[in-house]
Each structure stands twice: as C-alpha cells, then as structure tokens.
Amino acid sequence: LVPHLGDREKRDSVCPQGKYIHPQNNSICCTKCHKGTYLYNDCPGPGQDTDCRECESGSFTASENHLRHCLSCSKCRKEMGQVEISSCTVDRDTVCGCRKNQYRHYWSENLFQCFNCSLCLNGTVHLSCQEKQNTVCTCHAGFFLRENECVSCSNCKKSLECTKLCLPQIENVKGTEDSGTT
C-alpha cells in the first residue's frame, strides 16, 4: 500500500529502485531502461511501459538509465601505446589496456600511458611489474637507482643524491688503497 502524500511530499519522494520520476509529471514513476538501451519516450502513465530503444553501433549504456542518448564508445589512445582489450558493445564500453610486459602510468584519473616494465639490469627485481606499477629494482653494489634503472657509480656526480648510495663504495676503494700502503 502506498501511503497518502501531499503534493510537496510526493514531489520530494524518490521512486523505488529501478524507476525514475517522470520529468513532466512528478506523480508518475517510470521504469528505467535496461543497460544497452536508452530512453526514447517516457512512460505515458503509471504502470505503462517506458519506450526504450537499443543503442546504435558506436554507443553504449552500461547500467539501467533514463538517458536521452547512449554514451559514445571510448577509443583507445594509440599515441599513449594503448591497445584494445575488448571492443565496445551496446552495454559495455571499450576496454583499453597495455601489451604484455608493460604497465600503465596514469597521468590523471582517466588517462594512462603504456610503458615497458624495467628489467633491472645490474640489479635484482624487488617487486615484480604490476598492471599499474613498474618493476621495483634493487641495484647491485657499485650501482645506484636513477629513474628506475641501475646506473654505475662512476656516473655519480657529487651534487646528486647518489653520493649517499655510492659513498660506501668510494670509501671501500679508499680503504683498500690505504691498507695497501701500510
């Protein structure tokens, strides 16, 4: 049973799940359109069907809705190295991803670029490459990490952060030289 409501309460009330308020008559709750379809015409009255039409090629709706138009399918961004994992259907957007042995670097919330996973040459893999994170490398002695690559300490300039990492190596060399002179 539906309790009696005044106009204001009726206007402020929310339709049950799966229904929406008719835009011209807030006393009518229309059934939402299924995913893969969009709203062509609102239901004419209570208990009457909403006129929903299937999305055309190149468009989709991924959930029940009362959209006047389907959403345009996303295109994978080739310039970002993206590849199509699955194509767009009427009820699902295009899924874009990266190739094998690549990870996604998100420039912003919805924009990612594909990069090759680091191989950790002159080091060891500390954490394997993940879908959204590059390999984490640990460098061998005599090497320091610069932009996730193990670089020889011979390339370490005094002003760089690497001096801390390469210092023990330098001290060891000095130590062996000192011990050799005694």
């Epitope: 670097h105 420039w107 912003s108 919330e109 670029q113 990069f115």
Partner: nanobody, 120 residues
C-alpha cells in the same frame, strides 16, 4: 597560490634550438606530473610533452618526438623543454602546465606562456 613562470622563448631560425624553462611555486612540485602545451596562431591547444613526478615516464606528441626533450629539476622546482631541429610549424605560444590528478588529459594550472617563433 600556484604560479608557473615560463621563459626562454624567442625568434629562432629553422633547424635551430631553444631551451624553455618553467619556474614553479605555490605547490609541492615533486608530487605532480608536469607538461608543456602549445597553441599555434589560430589553432587549438596541443599537448607537446609530459613528465612524471619522479619516475622515468615521459610523453611526447608524434610531431616533436626525437626533437624535443622534457626534463625537470625537482631540487629547483623547475621544468625544462629542450627544443632542437625547430621547424616553422613549431611556432606557437608554449605553456607550462601542472597536470591534474583528476579527470582526463586535464591541466589544472598553466602559466602565461612564452612565444616561440621559428622563421628565417
């Protein structure tokens, strides 16, 4: 207040080089990806290059690949764009931009721009 101040633009002959700089202040520079955007006369904005906040990740538009190099010095809060083998079509106002972490391909702040003119 976020401030991005570009410098280094000017008139250069085709085949020449320029180095643009962008001094950033008002935010934690090391936390954000940064980029360069350009606008040629009578045209829309075009992404040129982006660089991640710490890692090795960079992006270059196809039109500048192999000619331009983006870099940053986090100790100086400065972004750079080294432009070599300049062409007439590189003529534009170049803007330094802070990349938003939300939305898609969005810059939330950019500077006043520096004009690069490539002409003989």
């Amino acid at each position: 207040e976020v401030q991005l101040l570009e410098s280094g633009g000017g008139l250069v002959q085709p085949g020449g080089s320029l180095r643009l700089s962008c001094a950033a202040s008002g935010f934690t520079f090391t936390r954000y990806s940064m980029g360069w955007v350009r606008q040629a006369p009578g045209k829309g904005l075009e992404w040129v290059s982006m660089i991640a906040h710490a890692g090795p990740e960079t992006y270059y538009a196809d039109s500048v690949k192999g000619r331009f190099t983006i870099s940053r010095d986090n100790s100086k809060n400065t972004l750079y764009l080294q432009m070599n083998s300049l062409r007439a079509e590189d003529t534009a106002v170049y803007y330094c931009a802070k990349i938003s972490q939300f939305g898609s391909n969005a810059f939330d702040y950019w500077g006043q721009g520096t004009l690069v003119t490539v002409s003989s």
